[in-house]
């Protein structure tokens, strides 16, 4: 229903703590360069204003839309043009164009230093001094680096962070308590970020219909006992929630997500038998838990899919009467029978089915034409299954670091024009799929692998869009979202690429590498590997292995040497010469 004051309505629904957190996230995602203190001041002003509207909904400006209120706040920031350049032009526009303009200026790769975790003692001291400010800093730092992070989920991660600090800061050995727990939260949050960015890309590029199809497939896999209308209702609501968050309407998004969680918990009987444990939790944990709840047990008596979608004499009539509903029921029926498939694969199958009906229902004898459609699915199913088998076998053989290197070589050959930092980031992320998915039971591997890879490749596409350099990447990123991963997998060595000339300084290292954390050392080595491939795109795996082994040996020797600097300056040039010879 309509409310006199939108801001008062949201403040009342969400409560002060969540309201302030969400406003902080919204401002941090829009103006990514501002400091925490600048944003905290704005948040306090907005909150104070919201309270006046709660007290009197008829007070001045309380009837304004949230976009108007927030946009006016952002546009009042001093030195906006100096700090943000053309983003300041957004402030000359009226709503809704102004908000659209802010959205277009969100930067997926802001030039901010990596978010460094303070040392345990220091962290506990500042947390104990002011937990609210400490958590505010966390929300600000994550939100500005991830401008599409799912806001209510970020509140959940902040809550996790808070609980870990509360527990570990009371322990004697704070460091060993904090590190593994915070690493776990960080890993989960980073995966959540790329997954949500993929959803927003789907919404932005292909509209609500595409996202809703994704949601129908995903929900049908998770809730195979819910009927089609129930799944469609959940998908419709989920689409609204995600549209709001992707569009910067974070208060509405969080409020609607809470409503959806409430609905699911009140209607467990028609949705799933697995929801109770989630529903017993408080709000943020409940919504998070529902989003990753285990699949319900599939009904035992499901008839073969062919009955309604191939053998039925009225397939074309049913399709003509309501195309979206008929295709939706197909996607629902196929997905509930296949929790072992990725959503991307299910959407490719639905697309194939739709194309078949479009063609066949216009012919003289439709049943003869679409009668083989399920058999035509086979190659589409085999391709990702083979991908999973090949890659998991390789991961088991090489381990995570070696697997990342294999992917780095592969992707540098596919798109050598892409910047080395982007290739290294992509390969490291793609390589994590092994650790994340290959250890799972067989029937969970494919959905885990393909849907994760799709999300990572979406980030590759977003970064490439800013500075397009590779025709290969442009080709794969221009097509439909579900075809991207197969497109990237099918790419081979880019024959148009002119190899980079060999620069000794690219492969010159200094003793400071010895004191770097293991992760940073790996990145240095992987940077060198990508540069080697750019110099020799057709180098064999054996040649590259020889060089990398030599390089590892060189680092090991010099980092153990008494006089490291001398070792690096004398042995380094020898290494470069050996590398050139090995690749000649």
């Amino acid at each position: 229903e309509a409310h006199k004051s939108e801001i008062a309505h949201r403040y009342n629904d969400l409560g002060e703590q969540h309201f302030k957190g969400l406003v902080l996230i919204a401002f941090s995602q829009y103006l990514q360069k501002c400091s925490y203190d600048e944003h905290a001041k704005l948040v306090q002003e907005v909150t104070d204003f919201a309270k006046t509207c709660v007290a009197d909904e008829s007070a001045a400006n309380c009837d304004k839309s949230l976009h108007t209120l927030f946009g006016d706040k952002l546009c009042a920031i001093p030195n906006l043009r100096e700090n943000y350049g053309e983003l300041a032009d957004c402030c000359t526009k009226q709503e809704p164009e102004r908000n659209e303009c802010f959205l277009q200026h969100k930067d997926d790769n802001p030039s901010l230093p990596p978010f460094e975790r303070p040392e345990a003692e220091a962290m506990c001291t500042s947390f104990k001094e002011n937990p609210t400010t400490f958590m505010g800093h966390y929300l600000h730092e994550v939100a500005r680096r991830h401008p599409y992070f799912y806001a209510p989920e970020l509140l959940y991660y902040a809550e996790q962070y808070n609980e870990i600090l509360t527990q570990c800061c009371a322990e004697a050995d704070k460091e060993s308590c904090l590190t593994p727990k915070l690493d776990g939260v960080k890993e989960k949050a980073l995966v959540s970020s790329v997954r949500q960015r993929m959803k927003c890309s789907s919404m932005q590029k292909f509209g609500e219909r595409a996202f809703k199809a994704w949601a129908v497939a995903r929900l049908s896999q998770t809730f195979p006992n819910a009927d089609f209308a129930e799944i469609t209702k959940l998908a419709t609501d989920l689409t609204k929630v995600n549209k709001e968050c992707c569009h910067g309407d974070l208060l509405e998004c969080a409020d609607d997500r809470a409503e959806l969680a409430k609905y699911m918990c009140e209607n467990q009987a028609t949705i799933s038998s697995k929801l109770q444990t989630c529903c017993d939790k408080p709000l943020l944990k409940k919504a998070h838990c529902l989003s990753e709840v285990e699949h319900d047990t599939m009904p035992a008596d499901l008839p073969a899919i062919a009955a309604d979608f191939v053998e039925d004499q009225e397939v074309c009539k049913n399709y003509a009467e309501a195309k979206d509903v008929f295709l939706g029921t197909f996607l629902y029926e196929y997905s509930r029978r296949h929790p072992d498939y990725s959503v991307s694969l299910l959407l490719r199958l639905a697309k194939k089915y739709e194309a078949t009906l479009e063609k066949c229902c216009a012919e003289a004898n439709p049943p003869a034409c679409y009668g083989t459609v399920l058999a035509e699915f086979q190659p589409l199913v085999e391709e990702p299954k083979n991908l999973v088998k090949t890659n998991c076998d390789l991961y088991e053989k090489l381990g995570e670091y070696g697997f990342q290197n294999a992917i780095l070589v592969r992707y540098t050959q596919k798109a050598p024009q892409v910047s080395t930092p982007t290739l290294v980031e992509a390969a490291r992320n793609l390589g994590r799929v092994g650790t994340k998915c290959c250890t799972l039971p067989e029937d969970q591997r494919l959905p885990c692998v393909e849907d994760y890879l799709s999300a990572i490749l979406n980030r590759v596409c977003l970064l490439h869009e800013k500075t397009p350099v590779s025709e290969h990447v442009t080709k794969c990123c221009s097509g439909s979202l579900v075809e991207r991963r197969p497109c990237f997998s099918a790419l081979t060595v880019d024959e148009t690429y002119v190899p980079k000339e060999f620069k000794a300084e690219t492969f010159t290292f200094h003793s400071d590498i010895c004191t770097l954390p293991e992760k940073e050392k790996q990145i240095k080595k992987q940077t060198a590997l990508a540069e080697l491939v750019k110099h020799k795109p057709k180098a064999t795996a054996e040649q590259l292995k020889t060089v990398m082994d030599d390089f590892a040996q060189f680092l090991d020797t010099c980092c153990k040497a008494a006089d490291k600097d001398t070792c690096f300056s004398t042995e380094g040039p020898n290494l470069v010469t050996r590398c050139k010879d090995a690749l000649a």
């Epitope: 009927d227 089609f228 209308a229 129930e230 209702k233 419709t236 609905y263 309604d308």
Partner: nanobody, 117 residues
């Protein structure tokens, strides 16, 4: 037994509006997804819209999006279809129908909507 009774049809000029109603009885209305289906003269059936028991609209045909609004009042066991910006091609018999799991299982008798100047 299940009964669905449509009303509100009639003759209207292009650009005009009509509101159809469907009174339901003989079943627990708020447990069922409901819908409107139409059949233009000499044409096949076309599904117009579907609404979940909770009131969430789960389907509109592309041909009516932005012009028609489906709604329901569970306390009155009534389904509605608000039709705005009517066109000649909206001329049809409009049926209220109950959805059960995979398809419509009960239909009303229909109400005729004629859009003509």
């Amino acid at each position: 037994e299940v009964q669905l009774l449509e009303s509100g049809g009639g003759l209207v000029q292009p650009g005009g509006s009509l509101r159809l109603s469907c009174a339901a009885s003989g079943f627990t209305f708020n447990h069922y997804t409901m819908g409107w289906v139409r059949q233009a003269p000499g044409k096949g059936l076309e599904w117009v819209s579907l609404i979940h028991p909770s009131g969430t609209v789960i389907y509109y045909a592309d041909s009516v999006k932005g012009r028609f609004t489906i709604s329901r009042d569970n306390s009155k066991n009534t389904l509605y279809l608000q039709m705005n910006s009517l066109r000649a091609e909206d001329t049809a018999v409009y049926y209220c129908a109950r959805w059960s799991s995979r398809a419509f299982d009960y239909w009303g008798q229909g109400t005729l909507v004629t859009v003509s100047s």
